[in-house]
Interface confidence: low
């Protein structure tokens, strides 16, 4: 698996007016690494392991770079013509990879309101876009804006590719093993919710890195988002993480429901226990 550095920049508009803030999250080898907050740019390690990678270094350069990128993306959003009422987002995701054979890959992806509409291979400069008319319109809009100053754009994207790889190599030089994977312990419990219904809660704990998929399935099919409640992924104080997902089901139908867990490429399913397992406190608010 290649080493990777991933930048996720988000800017927002409200009723057609681009908001002054932005959010940048940086992942190193798939793990949260730096965060530049909307309110105040604070490029800083996400957790102890990130501090181990770079020691006590200051984040001035990262802060400056991420702030600049945020401004660029705000200008891009301002040039999107189909701004409607309400809240809208423009997301730019840049990824660079170094493979075992030392070859590199770099790409850039734009999302509007969470929908991918434009991608670019930063090495070949090749653009691709989905077939939908909305995506095509957005893509034309953004590409035209980026082409307005072709020289600047060319330099900018070369720099994005080169800087990303340079940063990735610098971070990896620290020698810290980033690929530590600790699988989660998964525990399913049930508690009375109301007459004829029970609440089933699936808890995953002690896992690392923090990226995890946890959801309830009925007859093998994922339940809709609004019938489940998720807990935040939180540190558990041991350098690992914990989270949960809960749903209400009809008593007697327990055997139809399973908790599905996916973490670091591994997945498993966990049935609802039969009989009554007392849970002192329900997570439903």
């Amino acid at each position: 698996e290649p080493h990777s550095l991933r930048y996720n920049l988000t800017v927002l508009s409200w009723d057609g007016s681009v908001q002054s803030g932005f959010l940048t999250e940086v992942h190193l080898d798939g793990q949260p690494f730096l965060r530049c907050d909307r309110q105040k740019c604070r490029a800083k390690p996400q957790g102890q392991w990130a501090e181990d990678v770079l020691g006590n270094k200051t984040w001035d350069r990262e802060t400056r770079d991420l702030t600049g990128n945020g401004k660029d993306l705000r200008m891009t959003l301002a040039h999107i013509k189909d701004q409607k009422e309400g809240l809208h987002s423009l997301q730019e995701i840049r990824v660079c990879e170094i493979h075992e054979d030392n070859s590199t890959r770099s790409s850039q992806h734009f999302y509007y309101d969470g929908e991918l509409f434009l991608s670019q291979n930063l090495e070949t400069k090749e653009w691709t876009m989905p077939q939908s008319s909305r995506a095509q319109t957005l893509a034309m809009n953004v590409r035209n804006f980026l082409k307005e100053d072709a020289m600047k754009t060319k330099t900018h994207y070369h720099a994005m590719h080169a800087d990303c790889l340079q940063e990735l190599r610098r971070y990896l030089k620290s020698g810290v093993v980033l690929r530590r994977t600790v699988p989660p312990m998964v525990n399913v419990t049930r508690s009375e919710a109301s007459e004829g219904n029970i609440t089933v809660t699936c808890r995953a704990s002690g896992f690392y890195p923090w990226n995890i998929t946890l959801s309830w399935r009925q007859d093998g099919v994922s339940l809709s988002h609004d019938t489940q409640q998720w807990g935040d992924v939180l540190p558990d104080g041991n350098g690992t993480y914990q989270t949960w997902v809960a749903t209400r089901i009809c008593q007697g139908e327990e055997q139809r429901f399973t908790c599905y867990m996916e973490h670091s490429g591994n997945h498993s399913t966990h049935p609802v226990p039969s009989g009554k397992v007392l849970v002192l406190q329900s997570h439903w608010q």
């Epitope: 927002l12 803030g21 959010l23 409640q229 540190p235 104080g237 041991n238």
Partner: antibody, heavy 117, light 107 residues
Framework: QVQLVESGGDVVQPGRSLRLSCAAS????????IHWVRQAPGKGLEWVAV????????YYADSVKGRFIISRDNSKNTLYLQMNSLRAEDTAVYYC??????????WGQGTMVTVSS | AIQLTQSPSSLSASVGDRVTITCRAS??????LAWYQQKPGKAPKLLIY???SLESGVPSRFSGSGSGTDFTLTISSLQPEDFATYYC?????????FGPGTKVDIK
Amino acid sequence: QVQLVESGGDVVQPGRSLRLSCAASGFTFSNYNIHWVRQAPGKGLEWVAVIRYDGINKYYADSVKGRFIISRDNSKNTLYLQMNSLRAEDTAVYYCASGPPDAFNIWGQGTMVTVSS
Amino acid sequence: AIQLTQSPSSLSASVGDRVTITCRASQGISSALAWYQQKPGKAPKLLIYDASSLESGVPSRFSGSGSGTDFTLTISSLQPEDFATYYCQQFNSYPFTFGPGTKVDIK
């Protein structure tokens, strides 16, 4: 100017209910988790509850769980705290607070809630 | 829940003194700790976040250190406006508990 302004504090009898509001301005309210923190007269700070930026997740201190409900209306840039079954020990100044995930750098001025018979 | 203890609970000091306040967590919290200053009748004010990062606009005489379970707030040279109560708060996991506070008053 970034600010939070609490309102709704009052003198109420034990067992009664009260709803506090917190109006936000000067920042993108819908991007932030917002918290309630309280301080009893002459005592220290106590974290009360948090609601996620999108309203999906809520967490409460054990001392208020089951009695208080935190909610928000992002269209109105407003946070709420519905306080039910009030007790004398809920008497405090209630602050709303927000900021990045690792600190509260925005605080309201506070609103006083007195629970007394 | 993670408990935070602060020491001392109060201290008397003079202008120009170096003041150190400690905060101890009941379990490891990495660097997820903030320090606040509060004056009577006012809302708390953020001084330090992430255990050692100085909040924008806060004088450099304030500094924070520590990681894991033991943390320190230091005021290198106490000024008249620094007489207040200081609180630590952990952001490692819910509930986001506060320390009981340390009151710094004039000797």
